[in-house]
Each structure stands twice: as structure tokens, then as C-alpha cells.
């Protein structure tokens, strides 16, 4: 067979799938590694050719789409199963193809099991809600293409293994869930079941969404420099270990990049020669307000060290804030004999 | 740890209720559903009801719908079970139990309360 | 609802043999199925959930098995703390339903 751009293992497309359900799955070439679509492709006479590799298998197979039932079918660019099996777990190639011209990509498909609080070992999209915001709503995911407009579905909402009939705060409203004021005791994992008639015969697409409800962009604030403060100062006598830590308070904000950092003398502490050392921990409420740590640490400090400026800086979408700590050498102690018998007058 | 901690024995004369409460400690208690399940003198074990304290929601056996109510109060982590127009088969020992909402076993049970009922 | 049939009623055994237990669904439940032991004067404690898997704590003589109808919960080696009595418990479909229970008793 004459040479086919190999786009390999789309490992990026690791598609899973419950068991007993429709899938639709369409293939990647068109979406992620080509530059033109199935229709342009298709009129330009080339034709979409699938197979597959079982699980812990080689041997690369045709697909069978002459199962009963049309279990397994193709439409355009996407393979349909109607519904999946366990045992159809593993990886599918799509071939794009004609005389002069082949693409292929492969991808892995697994096909996995929920019980019936429907756990499942299925990766789960993460829906975040403002705390105490108002009315918001999540829609069941990943359901479009199943079945014609003309098609009324019926949808039943579940919070783990309980269906969602008269909750005090979140009413099912066909494909949406609307949360009327989302409180920390929401955060969850939130299920639609979508069933469907189709040829005489009902489906269920089943989607499991995690709800993490954050901190209100409303109650949202600049950095936050709890030290260093005016009420500490790092007294130091050379020689000795001068740790200062920076902690810094970031209300949650969506897509906010919060960095804290050094300056030392006006300068990153990579630019200047002293031997310094820094390491950070973070901490996380459960709103997801973020504290930031960075410990600065010189282990033998000098008398030049002790004079320098030492600022903390914090920054997020919210604004940009520093904090110098008070450094200063300490006064050594008077030494009794000399300095004490000095001060009396003694010659 | 938790615990779920029971109220103590009752006996009621038939036709009135009873109601039997249930205090957890040792855990969120908003961050799980209580359970309800009775066991008559010598016999199995019966499920009963829950509700989800966090939301308000409850539900019911079909057996015993419209004799049944539970409840829960938030601010003192406590769930209750009321059974009215009591007969003498509803002499049981009842037993609120702890369901984290993603499971559907129960991992923690309380002591269990002693409900006689007798003319 | 759901029926669960649990069987022998009472298993008469010596300590050190082993003991299984069997527990049928009146239809299918597939892996949501939980095994309870009780004493006298005691509330349940769980031992088994999702057919197979031991609770925090419980030793590894006990083991689950099956799946969709047909269910067994086996004490390898039985041990003096371990004659009670065992319920089976599905919640594949509201409402949960239990086995009767069957009596583990020295013999």
C-alpha cells in the first residue's frame, strides 16, 4: 500500500463512553489535523474509511457495520454506535483516502461502567458556581446530534444517587439546572439522563458533571499582603538565618494568573549574587480563594544583607500590590567589663 | 469520628405517633443523606425513607407514604423520623443511617430506638 | 420493587471452615449489591459494597462475589467474632431492598 500521512495516537482525544449507550464520535482529522472539511473532502472524491484495534490486541480489524440492528454505523465523518458495548473498547483509526491522497489518525475509546449513583472511572468536566451570586444554571453536556429537533426528550436531573424532585434551591428545567442561590453544600457531582425514542426503540445519554461553587467576582478583592506588616521586624545579626515569609491572599477569580515574588533591592532575586532561597506553598479555601507563601531565606546573612530592601509583590486580575519588610541588624549586646564599666566613669 | 447518636426508647399506644431523633456529629452533616431502615422483633430489615437535610428533599417507601414524615434540622445536625397511626406491627427497633450522596450503601448506623406499641 | 432472596436461612459451621452465603435478585442488579452482618443488640455494619469490595476495616477472610442475580458473600476461615446474622442489600432501583438475612451458627 503506497504511503498515508500517520498522524498516529491522538492520545489527546482519550474518548470515554458508558456502556449501553449511543455514541457519536467523530473523526479527528477534520477537527484537529487537516484544513478542510468532510464535505469539501467527500466532493473531491475521497472516502472516509474506518478500523480498529481491540483492546490489548495488534491486529488491526475493519469495522463491522453489518451487526443487527445497525449496532455500529457510519454517517458522514462520525461513527455511530447504537448503543456501545464493553467489549468495543480500543483504538479506532479514521482513513481519509482515494488514489493519490491518504490521512489517518487513530484515538482510544473506552467504554466504561457506572453504577447506579453513576460513579464511574469516566473524567468528569468541572462546572464552577459563583457562591451566593444569584441564579445560575448548567446545561446537560454533549447531547447535540443524538436525535432531531423534532424529538422531544425526557430529562431527569440527579445530585449522586438522588433524583433532584423538590430540592429547596436547584430545580431541573429540562436540559438546564438552575441553581437559585448556589451555597458551598452544592458542590457535587450532578447527573442528567436524557432518554429518547429512536426507530422504535429507547435510548438514555447519561452526563455527570462536577459543580465546585467559588468565591463571587462581587466579593472579590485585590492581593492581599498579610505579611510582611508593619508589626514585624526581622532583626538579624550577621551570621545568623534570615527567613522572611510573604503571604499573600488572592480572591478567587476565573482565568486570574495570581503571582507573588521577590524583589531584593529593586531586583529578582536570580539577578543579584547573594545565595538566596525561596519556596512557596499554596493553600486553598473552599470557595477556592487562594494563599500564597513564598519563604525568602538567606542562611548566613551579611551586614550588606541587612541593609537591603526586601519587597513582596502580589498580582492578579484584580490589581498588583507589594509589601517591603522591616530588616535591620541587631544591636549587639553590651559587653559588661569595657562598655558597662565605661559608662560609670571608671579609668 | 461520626457517630449517630439515637433517641431512647418509647412505647405508644396505637392510633398516636411517635418521633424518634437522630444527632449526627463527626462530619458534615449537610454533606450526606439520612437514611431510615426498621427491623421488627426477629425479623429483617426494612427501608423506610431519607432525606437529604442540604436541600430539603425527602422521600418514602410506597409502604409507608402518608404515615411517614422526615426531617432534619441543620442547625443542630439532627434528623427525625415521625410515624403516625402506630399498629402493633410497627413495634421495631428504628435506625437512622449515613449515605454520603454518590453511594447508596450505608457505612454508619445509629444505636437504633426501641418503638413498642401496645394497648 | 426488587426481591432479594438470601439462602441457606440459617448456616450451621465450625470455626476455621468456610462459609458462603448466597443472595438472589429478582432481577437484575449488576454490581449494586452490599452484605451487612449483624450481632444481637447491635445495628448492621457494612461489610461489602459493589458486589466485591470490602469496607474500611473488615478483614480479608470475607469476600464478595457476582454479579447481576446471583450473589455470594464467603468467610474463609470462620472466626468466634463472625456468627451473626448477614443481609444483602441492592440499590440498583429505588427502593432499596434487603434480603431476609441468613443466621451463621456455631455448629
Known amino acids: 500500500s503506497e504511503r498515508c500521512d500517520d498522524w498516529g495516537l491522538d492520545t489527546m482525544r482519550q474518548i470515554q463512553v458508558f456502556e449501553d449507550e449511543p455514541a457519536r464520535i467523530k473523526c479527528p482529522l477534520f477537527e484537529h489535523f487537516l484544513k478542510f472539511n468532510y464535505s469539501t473532502a467527500h466532493s473531491a472524491g475521497l472516502t472516509l474509511i474506518w478500523y480498529w484495534t481491540r483492546q490489548d490486541r495488534d491486529l488491526e480489524e475493519p469495522i463491522n457495520f453489518r451487526l443487527p440492528e445497525n449496532r455500529i454505523s457510519k454517517e458522514k465523518d462520525v461513527l455511530w454506535f447504537r448503543p456501545t458495548l464493553l467489549n468495543d473498547t480500543g483504538n479506532y483509526t479514521c482513513m481519509l483516502r482515494n488514489t493519490t491522497y491518504c490521512s489517518k489518525v487513530a484515538f482510544p475509546l473506552e467504554v466504561v461502567q457506572k453504577d447506579s449513583c453513576f460513579n464511574s472511572p469516566m473524567k468528569l468536566p468541572v462546572h464552577k458556581l459563583y457562591i451566593e451570586y444569584g441564579i445560575q444554571r448548567i446545561t446537560c453536556p454533549n447531547v447535540d446530534g443524538y436525535f432531531p429537533s423534532s424529538v422531544k426528550p425526557t430529562i431527569t436531573w440527579y445530585m449522586g444517587c438522588y433524583k433532584i424532585q423538590n430540592f429547596n434551591n436547584v430545580i431541573p428545567e429540562g436540559m438546564n439546572l438552575s441553581f437559585l442561590i448556589a451555597l458551598i453544600s452544592n458542590n457535587g457531582n450532578y447527573t442528567c439522563v436524557v432518554t429518547y425514542p429512536e426507530n422504535g426503540r429507547t435510548f438514555h445519554l447519561t452526563r455527570t458533571l462536577t459543580v465546585k461553587v467559588v468565591g463571587s467576582p462581587k466579593n472579590a478583592v485585590p492581593p492581599v499582603i498579610h505579611s510582611p506588616n508593619d508589626h514585624v521586624v526581622y532583626e538579624k545579626e550577621p551570621g545568623e538565618e534570615l527567613l522572611i515569609p510573604c503571604t499573600v491572599y488572592f480572591s478567587f477569580l476565573m482565568d486570574s494568573r495570581n503571582e507573588v515574588w521577590w524583589t531584593i533591592d529593586g531586583k529578582k532575586p536570580d539577578d543579584i549574587t547573594i545565595d538566596v532561597t525561596i519556596n512557596e506553598s499554596i493553600s486553598h479555601s473552599r470557595t477556592e480563594d487562594e494563599t500564597r507563601t513564598q519563604i525568602l531565606s538567606i542562611k548566613k546573612v551579611t551586614s550588606e544583607d541587612l541593609k537591603r530592601s526586601y519587597v513582596c509583590h502580589a498580582r492578579s486580575a484584580k490589581g498588583e500590590v507589594a509589601k517591603a519588610a522591616k530588616v535591620k541588624q541587631k544591636v549587639p549586646a553590651p559587653r559588661y567589663t569595657v562598655e558597662l564599666a565605661c559608662g560609670f566613669g571608671a579609668t | 469520628q461520626v457517630q449517630l447518636v439515637q433517641s431512647g426508647a418509647e412505647v405508644k399506644k396505637p392510633g398516636s405517633s411517635v418521633k424518634v431523633s437522630c444527632k449526627a456529629s463527626?462530619?458534615?452533616?449537610?454533606?450526606?443523606?439520612i437514611h431510615w431502615v426498621r427491623q421488627a422483633p426477629g425479623q429483617g430489615l426494612e427501608w423506610m425513607g431519607y432525606?437529604?437535610?442540604?436541600?430539603?428533599?425527602?422521600e418514602y417507601a410506597q409502604k409507608f407514604q402518608g404515615r411517614v414524615t422526615i426531617t432534619a434540622d441543620e442547625s443542630t445536625s439532627t434528623a427525625y423520623m415521625e410515624l403516625s397511626s402506630l399498629r402493633s406491627e410497627d413495634t421495631a427497633v428504628y435506625y437512622c443511617?449515613?449515605?454520603?450522596?454518590?453511594?447508596?450503601?450505608?457505612?454508619?448506623w445509629g444505636q437504633g430506638t426501641l418503638v413498642t406499641v401496645s394497648s | 420493587e426488587i426481591v432479594m432472596t438470601q439462602s441457606p436461612a440459617t448456616l450451621s459451621v465450625s470455626p476455621g471452615e468456610r462459609a458462603t452465603l448466597s443472595c438472589r435478585a429478582s432481577?437484575?442488579?449488576?454490581?449494586?449489591l452490599a452484605w451487612y452482618q449483624q450481632k444481637p443488640g447491635q445495628a448492621p455494619r457494612l461489610l461489602i459494597y459493589?458486589?466485591?469490595t470490602r469496607a474500611t476495616g473488615i478483614p480479608a477472610r470475607f469476600s464478595g462475589s457476582g454479579s447481576g442475580t446471583e450473589f455470594t458473600l464467603t468467610i474463609s476461615s470462620l472466626q468466634s467474632e463472625d456468627f451473626a446474622v448477614y443481609y444483602c442489600?441492592?440499590?440498583?432501583?429505588?427502593?432499596?431492598?434487603f434480603g431476609q438475612g441468613t443466621k451463621v451458627e456455631i455448629k
Open positions: 459493589g458486589a466485591s
Open positions: 432481577q437484575s442488579v449488576s454490581s449494586n
Open positions: 443511617a449515613r449515605v454520603p450522596y454518590s453511594t447508596a450503601y450505608f457505612d454508619y
Open positions: 432525606i437529604i437535610p442540604a436541600y430539603g428533599q425527602a
Open positions: 442489600q441492592q440499590y440498583n432501583n429505588w427502593p432499596w431492598t
Open positions: 463527626g462530619g458534615q452533616f449537610n454533606d450526606y443523606a
